[in-house]
Structures are given as C-alpha cells and as structure tokens.
Amino acid sequence: HSFGPGPGLGTPRSPCNARGPCRLFFRVCLKPGVSQEATESLCALGAALSTSVPVYTEHPGESAAALPLPDGLVRVPFRDAWPGTFSLVIETWREQLGEHAGGPAWNLLARVVGRRRLAAGGPWARDVQRTGTWELHFSYRARCEPPAVGAACARLCRSRSAPSRCGPGLRPCTPFPDECEAPSVCRPGCSPEHGYCEEPDECRCLEGWTGPLCTVPVSTSSCLNSRVPGPASTGCLLPGPGPCDGNPCANGGSCSETSGSFECACPRGFYGLRCEVSGVTCADGPCFNGGLCVGGEDPDSAYVCHCPPGFQGSNCEKRVDRCSLQPCQNGGLCLDLGHALRCRCRAGFAGPRCEHDLDDCAGRACANGGTCVEGGGSRRCSCALGFGGRDCRERADPCASRPCAHGGRCYAHFSGLVCACAPGYMGVRCEFAVRPDGADAVPAAPRGLRQADPQRFLAGVIAVIVVVVIAIVAGIVVLVISRKKRMAKYEKAEIKEMGEMHRELNA
C-alpha cells in the first residue's frame, strides 16, 4: 500500500507542510452498503486505526512520492455477519510532531469513500483512490473468525443464555460470547483452515484449495483446471468449475454468474469486462447520489463532483442533515426527505418555510359562524350562540345558564334561545316586570306596549329577534365567504404540501 501525490500532479507535496516531523495514520471505517452514507452514521460494521507508525521528516529536495507508512495490517473486527456489500471509508491523518507545533496537531489529509462488494474468505482485493492531489493504494479482504464460516461469516454456534451453561467440552462461542461453540458439524476431517460448511456434513473449500477435505492446493491437484477432484480414489468429476472460479475479476472486482457467463462488479476507479482498466473519468460515474461530474475527461485529469442538495464530500458520499440549519421558521417541523426538504407548519403559518404569518385570522377557521378575534399576539374564536370551544365546533346548550329571569321558560333555538316569560314579565330575558294596574313597568317599558296583551307582546318580541338574527346570520355568511376565499389559496397549498410529504415519506 502507498499514499502520496498522484501521477502528473506536479512536484510531490510533503504531508508535513514544512513544519517539522510528522507521521501518518490511517483510520478505516466500515459502514453498511448504502449509497447515501450519512455523515453522522457510525461505522456500524467496525472501525480501526493503524498502529506502529514511522515518523516522517522532510528534507529539502526530498521526494514525497514514497512516504513511510504504518506497518502491517489494519484489522477491523466486525461482530455480526459479513454483509458482502459495504462502504469503505479510509481517512489519512497527519500528526504534526514537535514543540513548536504546540504539541501534537491532527489534520485530515485525505478521505476516500467507496462502495464495495466482497465475499469473506476471498483473496486480497487491490484498489487505488484519488482525492484532490493525493493517491492512496491499498488492498483489503474479509476473513471470518472461527467458528463463523462462509462468504457471509455465518455463525455455527448454538444460542445459550450464558457461557457458564456451555455443555461438557464446549467453549464460549467467539466472537459471540453469549453463545456456545457448537460441536463440529462439518464433514469429519474438513480442513479448519481452508474449508468451511454451511450445512452439516459438508466441506466447502476456500479459493485456492480443493479436495474432499479442502487440503489440496489447487496448483497441485491431479485434476485439470476444468475439473474438480472427487471423493478419494474416484478420479475427477465433471462438470468443471463455474465461470467465477478463480475470480476472473481484477482489482478487487467481485464476480457473479449470469446465465453461464460471468459479470464483474468493479470498484469505483476500475472498469472493463474484468475490471482491468483503471483511472477514474467522469464516464465511470465517480460521483455518488446523482452528483454531477465535471472535468475528468481522461484518467490523468482530476474530476470534481457537484453534489445534489443534501449531499457533500469529494464524491457526494456524505449526507447533510439540512434540518440542523433550522430552515423552518415560526416553530415549523423540518423533514429532510433526502431529495427534498419539507416544513410542516404550526397553525397560523404557511409557506415552504412557514414564513407567512397568516394574520387577520386568515389561518384560523372558526366553525359554525364563529368569528376570529385577534389580540395580545394570539387568535381566538368568538362563537355564535349555541356553539363553544376553541374552534366553535362544540354544541353549547344556551339554556344551561338559566338565562330567563323571573321563572321564564327557556327554549333552545337554532340561533340561540327564546324566553317564554311568566305572566307579569316581559323582555328578551323576562327582565321587565309589568304592573297589572297599567302603571309604569319597572323598569319602564315602551309606551305602546304598556297595555298590550302579553301574547301579542311576546309575538312582537319574537318577530324583532328573528329579524335581528337574520341580519346577523347574513352578515356572518358574508364574512365567512370572504374569509374562506382568502384562506383558500393557503389551505390548498398546505393540503397539497402535506399530500406530497405523505407520498414522499412513503416513497
């Protein structure tokens, strides 16, 4: 593996920036194999930092093309089954050493991200990634820790509640310590190094090994390459290996069989039938998430990715939490749908970012002819007679408060109430006492009604009430219609937006 300036990129740069000695570390991070790799997501499959890092000291005129790198392997243990498809993130960090640097200073020099497909147990896959002016060459492979086996490192351990409960001769299962190692289920004698089994009494061989117990290297097999050794003393069996045997895909490509032939899924940076062509151009589609690739017409010219909204990173591989910028105003709820940002507005606000304050009560619908009243920075409904509650949706009993005085009987009416007064009383609420001797009423009643028959008087009062009610209802209808017209465009927009949001969230 190597890390240094890419070819044709001018004078090699020192990673130390002429600030004294430094050393390089690699941080390797594995994430589940999705293209929308969220920046905040953890390295769910595992992460590790390189160790045993040599110090690099810049000397005048020295080429930085071959930098001393961390020795040996970077092991990234993963606890669960191997997913096969994953995102590989490799960060190159510089640690600046020396007193004048103010103690150790860390800087991220480069970060490469790529989606990969890789079966466990396969050979080393080689890769090269460029980022800016730096180029990173590396190899990677996935291996199962016994007793997990197979391309997906399937467990062959039996579930138990505690290691102490493991039966005679059985040990705790690694790397699943809450389970116990199962008794051998593979064919007796199956090589623990080069063979594995996914079913009891079978012995499957890792690449490069053959034979009934996977103990024969492929190169020393007595069979031709087109045949597979059979059970002991049976010679060779036909048919020969599948089209993916021997892995025809170069540069870490993974092979899959397709109707008698093979297909290579190449890592980014490689293409061709067998992933044999290297050098990234825009035609290779190096930008994730639909990003626009600019430049990079030939392998020697660098490309730049212009990312869609909600993505960033040199290859648009990082997801941005756009809601963290609090784009929704007036307490609106932000929803980042990936390809769009939506704001769910509080009552009384509208617009793509809840920026419109629906003043003049336009955003408040009072039901049943209620009128909206503003005051003190809030809105409330003044309900028509017979209705109550926050939005005038609750039916109120107008007679509940016993509004008719002096023993008058209350009758609920569509527009409110009517009082039938007891003899000797009159008025909308029977509040006036009528003197039987024709003297003034207390309080005084209109002259023309003093000697009136109470029944005729009541009919007159009802007629007046009806006229007043009709006038009020007509006024309310006009107000409601005009308000509805003003609200229509906002409500229509809100309903459409909520519908879109619902569809997009379900998409």
């Epitope: 999705v34 293209s35 035609a283 589609g285 998430n289 626009l292 690739c293 909204p309 769009a340």
Partner: antibody, heavy 117, light 107 residues
Framework: EVQLVESGGGLVKPGGSLRLSCAAS????????MNWVRQAPEKGLEWVGQ??????????HYAESVKGRFTISREDSKNTVYLQMNSLKTEDTAVYYC????????WGQGTTVTVSS | NIQMTQSPSSLSASVGDRVTITCKAS??????VSWYQQKPGKSPKLLIY???NRYTGVPSRFSGSGSGTDFTLTISSLQPEDFATYYC?????????FGGGTKVEIK
C-alpha cells in the same frame, strides 16, 4: 464517447401501451441515476421519472402526471433503462429523452411518441 | 412544485451582440439552477450548473449568475452557433422543473 440511444417510440391510440428503451455506451452505466425527460411539440422540458442504483434498491420516482401509468426499470448487465408507458393519453405525445444523474448531464437524441386516435 | 418563469420567450439578436436571459423561481432555490441549450431537432445540452459554473467544454462567452429566486444567463458575444432555445431548470427541490424556454433568433 458517451452515447445514449433511445428507441421504441411510435404511434399509439389513447389507452394503449408502449415501451421505450435507452441503451448506454461509453459510461459505467451501473453507477448512474437514469431519468426520462419529455418535450411536447413546441413546448418546454418536463421531467417524467427517475431510477436510482442497485445499492439504492433501484428506487424510482415519478412526476404526478404519469404516476401509476408509467414504470421505469433498468438492466445494468445490458446498460439499458426502460420506460413502460400504459394507459397513454393524447397529452403524453412528446419526444422522450433519457438522461443521466441528478443534473441531467448526458442526454440521448430522443424518440417520438404520438398518442392519437 | 417550484415554477420557473423565463423571459423573454423569444428574442432577436445579431452576431456579436450581448444577450441576457432571465429566469425567476417561485421560491428560493439557492444556487441549484442549471441552464441548457437546445438546437432544433437536437437534444438539450448542459451549459451552466450551480447557477454560475460552466460545464465541461462550454465556451467562456456563456456565463450564469444569481441566487435565491432571480437568475441570469449571459452570452457575451453571440456566435452563429448560439442561435437556439435556452432553458433554465431548478434542482433545489424534487421534482426538477424547467422554465418555458427562450428562443434566440437571428435578427
């Protein structure tokens, strides 16, 4: 050289079906989001739909005007994307282009679909 | 959906003229605006992305500007091969939407 070639257009009656194909060459097809964009006669451009990558479970998105009637699919092994159009209406008459990415960087030459009785 | 309103719908100009086409978005689209050129019988070609960045191979006489809701495509010195229809498109909010187009004709 990048090339996108559409085919499958033609004359169809309202209510009928048609399947358009777009064959790509010169690009690593499986790494590209693919779109269909149409242009009615003497009119502007209208995005029709999109299909993403295998790693995105081949997620598809459609314009409201075609939702439920049009279906986009892709066959990476053949470097081809398809547009299956059912219950066609006269207003679907247009030149249909396939195009790549989120920003429609590469375009095909287009194929004409005429819906008429 | 976000509406993109382009003006003028057509214009006549001579070779060497400076031509300006405007595009107005119905709401803030940041700088997520692209411009496309389409010649008769041909497919559109990407000219400008991110409101002001020239795409690969696009001549320097084409420039874009603007952010928010108001955007401009300028051709500093019109060439014979520039007579075409130009479309703006917004990519801030899904689905992407286009302007009605501006036809640039020879005077």
């Amino acid at each position: 050289e990048v090339q996108l070639v559409e085919s499958g257009g033609g004359l169809v009656k309202p209510g009928g079906s048609l399947r358009l194909s777009c064959a790509a060459s010169g690009i690593t097809f499986s790494n590209f989001w693919m779109n269909w964009v149409r242009q009615a006669p003497e009119k502007g451009l209208e995005w029709v739909g999109q299909i993403r990558l295998k790693s995105d479970d081949y997620a598809t998105h459609y314009a409201e005007s075609v939702k439920g009637r049009f279906t986009i699919s892709r066959e990476d092994s053949k470097n081809t994307v398809y547009l299956q159009m059912n219950s066609l209406k006269t207003e679907d008459t247009a030149v249909y282009y396939c195009t790549t990415g989120y920003y429609f960087d590469y375009w095909g030459q287009g194929t004409t679909v005429t819906v008429s009785s | 959906n976000i509406q993109m309103t382009q003006s003028p719908s057509s214009l006549s100009a001579s070779v060497g003229d400076r031509v300006t086409i405007t595009c107005k978005a119905s709401e803030n689209v940041g700088t997520y605006v692209s411009w496309y050129q389409q010649k008769p019988g041909k497919s559109p070609k990407l000219l400008i992305y991110g409101a002001s960045n020239r795409y690969t191979g696009v001549p320097s006489r084409f420039s874009g500007s603007g952010s928010g809701t108001d955007f401009t495509l300028t051709i500093s010195s019109l060439q014979p091969e520039d007579f075409a229809t130009y479309y703006c498109g917004q990519f801030y909010s899904f689905p992407s939407t286009f302007g009605g187009g501006t036809k640039v004709e020879i005077k």
